[in-house]
Every structure is written in structure tokens, then in C-alpha cells.
Amino acid sequence: SGVFQLQLQEFINERGVLASGRPCEPGCRTFFRVCLKHFQAVVSPGPCTFGTVSTPVLGTNSFAVRDDSSGGGRNPLQLPFNFTWPGTFSLIIEAWHAPGDDLRPEALPPDALISKIAIQGSLAVGQNWLLDEQTSTLTRLRYSYRVICSDNYYGDNCSRLCKKRNDHFGHYVCQPDGNLSCLPGWTGEYCQQPICLSGCHEQNGYCSKPAECLCRPGWQGRLCNECIPHNGCRHGTCSTPWQCTCDEGWGGLFCDQDLNYCTHHSPCKNGATCSNSGQRSYTCTCRPGYTGVDCELELSECDSNPCRNGGSCKDQEDGYHCLCPPGYYGLHCEHSTLSCADSPCFNGGSCRERNQGANYACECPPNFTGSNCEKKVDRCTSNPCANGGQCLNRGPSRMCRCRPGFTGTYCELHVSDCARNPCAHGGTCHDLENGLMCTCPAGFSGRRCEVRTSIDACASSPCFNRATCYTDLSTDTFVCNCPYGFVGSRCEFPVGLPPSFPW
């Protein structure tokens, strides 16, 4: 889209005569008609395909034409076009005599023509005026002309559309060649991408406006380069989000369980040896003569209940002595004189004889233990619940109470992240070990398919009037190849034919 501009400067008709040689009475009241058309090797009559324009009466016989662009735009004359400038043209300028005020072609006598010039050639788009002078036997016309682009059109042919903008679709101004020049703080093909705060982490940070650094889930800090540990992580750190890698001596999901209680608290008294035995637990091995969880109590040797199978302990100066009940013997009453005949197994245990009946062994039913099946099993001692689940004894069975986000008999299953349908616009959700992933349908993108994107440029049949659509798949753009008689980015505008003049 652009404008062909014609500046009339001077017309000389010293004798004041028409093309026929007849003089004008009282003088030649002169106006001009201009026809601009496609290049013709020999300029011939026919439609003015690029446009026409007429002037009012500008003077009598010989006169200079003043620049009247500020007062209504009559000089230079404007011939706008809404197609790609082809670089060549044909121009016809006619000078006519107006006997009266009606300048319409049908109102003038056929011999009112004063002079007619026709030129053709190449003309590039540019700001510089081309000066020309055409002389005939009786008249001389001096004029200049040029082609410039309309607002928002650029390039050698005024075919490149570029509209400066500062909104969601881009932040740019247009260079003289029509290329985009991004406003400060923006980048990308259409200057839609903000330039984040300098140093903002490439993967873990992003921004929606320049000089910003917004952190993706799991990251923190001014530059989004510090991971956020698991919520509740006490004595631990992370190298990726939601981790809780325990410091030395700490354990558990939140690193809040003391695995080195001995070093951190020194609980064992009276020279006892301390052994770490798990989460916040320890065992004190007491020196002789001491007892208690922390070996804090002095004891007689009988206090340690050395006599087994119901034997009673008697303190002596040099130690102790066990008095064994019937059926048992030995230093600690540890040997049995019972056999399977004495039915020694409790709680439904079955008895197996050993050493030709000299002693026996009990095979206990589930939930019972001990040499005579006399002890009930605590089913939670093996800590069967995964992912921090809490074990509860329920009669002969056990049950796991799971933490939020886990399920299953032993809390071994993650609750599906896809259960809440997080993918927008019909995206398909896939559960992953550390979260979820959305597969988006055509026309959508983003982590949750929330971003609308363009689809194959020609798929929407953007070209009108049976034009051919060509797509550039790498840039998702299209170009319409117009049939004869149509112009416009989508070939939607017919080439307008002006009113016919008697050229």
C-alpha cells in the first residue's frame, strides 16, 4: 500500500491556444487530468489500473503551480494504491481548457484539449522527487513525481506491513525496512518474550515482564537458583526441589529423627556403652552393678533377673544363686526336664521332641512367640508401613494409617496427580514419578495446555477468491497467491477500475 505523488510546477502556453491551434477565448482556463496505469511499452488508451485524479482550474495560459499540500493536498496530487508497487508504471497527463465551471468530461467540447503527454518507465519507492519537463510545439509542462509507502507499510515495494505495538502480541517499533525493532526489555521474533532479570536461572525461573524473575514450583531466591526442600524438612538439604537429604546423624522423611542420639545427647550413665539403635532410640550396655534404661541405677546381681523359667534368685556375697522350679535345672534354670508329654507349649503351639525325648521345641501359631509360645507377637515391630505411614495393631492383624498423598495396604502407592484433571482444553494427563505431564491437542501448548497457539497456517483456508495458499511450516505463516483481478494479503480486494475517461 502506498501513494504515487505528482507535483505540477509550471505550465507554459504563451499563445493561449488549444491542441487544434484554435485560440481560447478570452484565455485558456487550464486544469489537468492524470491517469496512472501499469507499464505499457507503448502507452495506449484503456483503464487507469493504478488510479486517476483531476485538478480544479489552476491558471490561465502560462502559470506556476504553487505547492498547496498544506491547504487540502491538491498539489502534489495523490494517487493511492493498495497493492505491491511493481516498480514500473505508465503516466498520462492531459491539460484541458474549461470554458465554464463544469469540468466533467461530458460537459466539455471535444476540442477543449490543450496538450497531452504520456511517459512510462521504472520508478523505485523513495523520498526523492524525479524532475521532468515535457515540451510540445505550443506548450511546456514541468513537474516532478515519486512513490512513497502508506503508513505502516515498508520495503522496496511497500508490501511489508508493520504496525508498532506495545501489548500482549508484541512490544516493538518498525525499522525503515519494515523489520521489527524490540522495545527495551523485550526479545524474540515478535518481541513477545520479556528479557528476565540478569542471572535469572534459565530453567527454574521465568518472567512475564522485563527485569522480573519469577520462580517455578520448587525454586526460590532472587535468581530462582535455590531449591525448596520438602515441606517440614528439619535437618536436611536439597539439590532438586522437594528433596530432604538428611544431614549426618539424622533420618526419616523430614530428617527429624535422631539417628545419632548417643553423640547428640550422651544418655548413658555410669560409664555405660551407648549404641544407636534407630530413630531417636539407643541402647545402653551397663557396666556390672548398674541397671536402668540409661544405667542410672545401682543393682544387686539379682536385679537383672538372671534366673529363667520362674527360678528365684538369692543374693550371695560372691554373686547369686538360682533356686529352680520343678522340671528345670542349670545355673540359670535354663535346662528343662520336661518333655512333650508334659504339654509345655501354650496358646495352641505344637510340641516336637528332641534328643530322643530329652528335651523339646515348641512351634508357635501366628501371633505368638517364646520358647513355650507364651508371648504375644507385636506385629508392628518390623515397621511394615512405607512412606512414613503409622502402624496400628488391630487384634490378630495390623493396619497402616497413611500420610496425605499415599495409599495402599502398606502406604506404598502414590495418589494419582491426574485425579484432579489438571490438563486444560482436552489435554491427556500422564502420571510420572515426580508429578505429571500433559499431552496437548493441536492448537494448544504449555505445561497444562493452557496456552492457545496457532495451527497450520493454510488449514483455515485464509485466502479468498480461489487464491492459492502457501504455508511456511517452520514459521507457521502463509502467503496467498492472488488470481488476476484481486489484491490484498488474502486476495480479498478486487482491483478497482475508476470511471472511464475518453483518453
Epitope: R160, S454, S460, P462, Y470, T475, D476, V479, R490, E492
Partner: nanobody, 125 residues
Framework: EVQLVESGGGLVQAGGSLRLSCVAS????????MGWFRQAPGKEREFVSS????????NYTDSVKGRFTISKDNAKNMVHLQMNSLKPEDTAVYYC??????????????????WGQGTQVTVSS
């Protein structure tokens, strides 16, 4: 951005007719043309028909030519799709779309779409 709301979908027997409507609100001055796409289960979204916002012409995909007619109600910023002689293969979710022509690039024109939420059309045999 342009907001689009479709209506008029439903269940119809083969050979019957339906009229879909789409009303546009928001920055309608940016619209270049409006039209309809459709997506059958398990298939890609495909173009059906479009109408130039300035009244310069209409386009149809080959399979609906002569059966579907697109029109525009300027006063209400609405586009209608009159669907006659419906076939079972026309069953799909029909989406209204507005095209915005943004900028001329070295390779051609880039277009952007705003979409409605879709309306179900079911044609039983």
C-alpha cells in the same frame, strides 16, 4: 483477546438440519475473519468454514460445500453456520474461531486464533 460463545449444537438424524451460532465479545476490532473448526473423537481439529469480517467473502472445506452456509449478523457481532443434509460423518465438537492477522513477516502473514469452548453435534443414522 476475543471471547467466543457457541450455541445450537445437539442430536439430529441423518439428513436433518442444525444452525450453530457464535457471538464475539471483547476486542472485536482486531478480528480478520471468523469461522468454524470441528474435531471428531481421536482425530485432528479440521477447518469447516470461514467468513471475512469485512464481508469480502466466504470459504468452505470441500466435504461441506453445498450443504453448509456461513453468514454474519453485523449488528450483533454473530456468525451462524446453517448445516443442512447432515451426515453421520459430520458428528464432532464444533469450535468457533476468530482469526487475527497480526504482522507481515519475511515468510508471509502470521495468524492467531481465539477459540470458543465448543458445542457437540451428533448425527445419528
Amino acid at each position: 483477546e476475543v471471547q467466543l460463545v457457541e450455541s445450537g449444537g445437539g442430536l439430529v438424524q441423518a439428513g436433518g438440519s442444525l444452525r450453530l451460532s457464535c457471538v464475539a465479545s471483547g476486542d472485536t476490532s482486531e478480528i480478520y475473519d471468523m469461522g468454524w473448526f470441528r474435531q471428531a473423537p481421536g482425530k485432528e481439529r479440521e477447518f469447516v468454514s470461514s467468513i471475512h469480517w469485512g464481508g469480502r467473502g466466504t470459504n468452505y472445506t470441500d466435504s461441506v460445500k453445498g450443504r453448509f452456509t456461513i453468514s454474519k449478523d453485523n449488528a450483533k457481532n454473530m456468525v451462524h453456520l446453517q448445516m443442512n443434509s447432515l451426515k453421520p460423518e459430520d458428528t464432532a465438537v464444533y469450535y468457533c474461531a476468530a482469526t487475527r492477522l497480526i504482522v507481515y513477516t519475511p515468510t508471509g502473514f502470521r495468524q492467531y486464533f481465539d477459540w470458543g469452548q465448543g458445542t457437540q453435534v451428533t448425527v445419528s443414522s
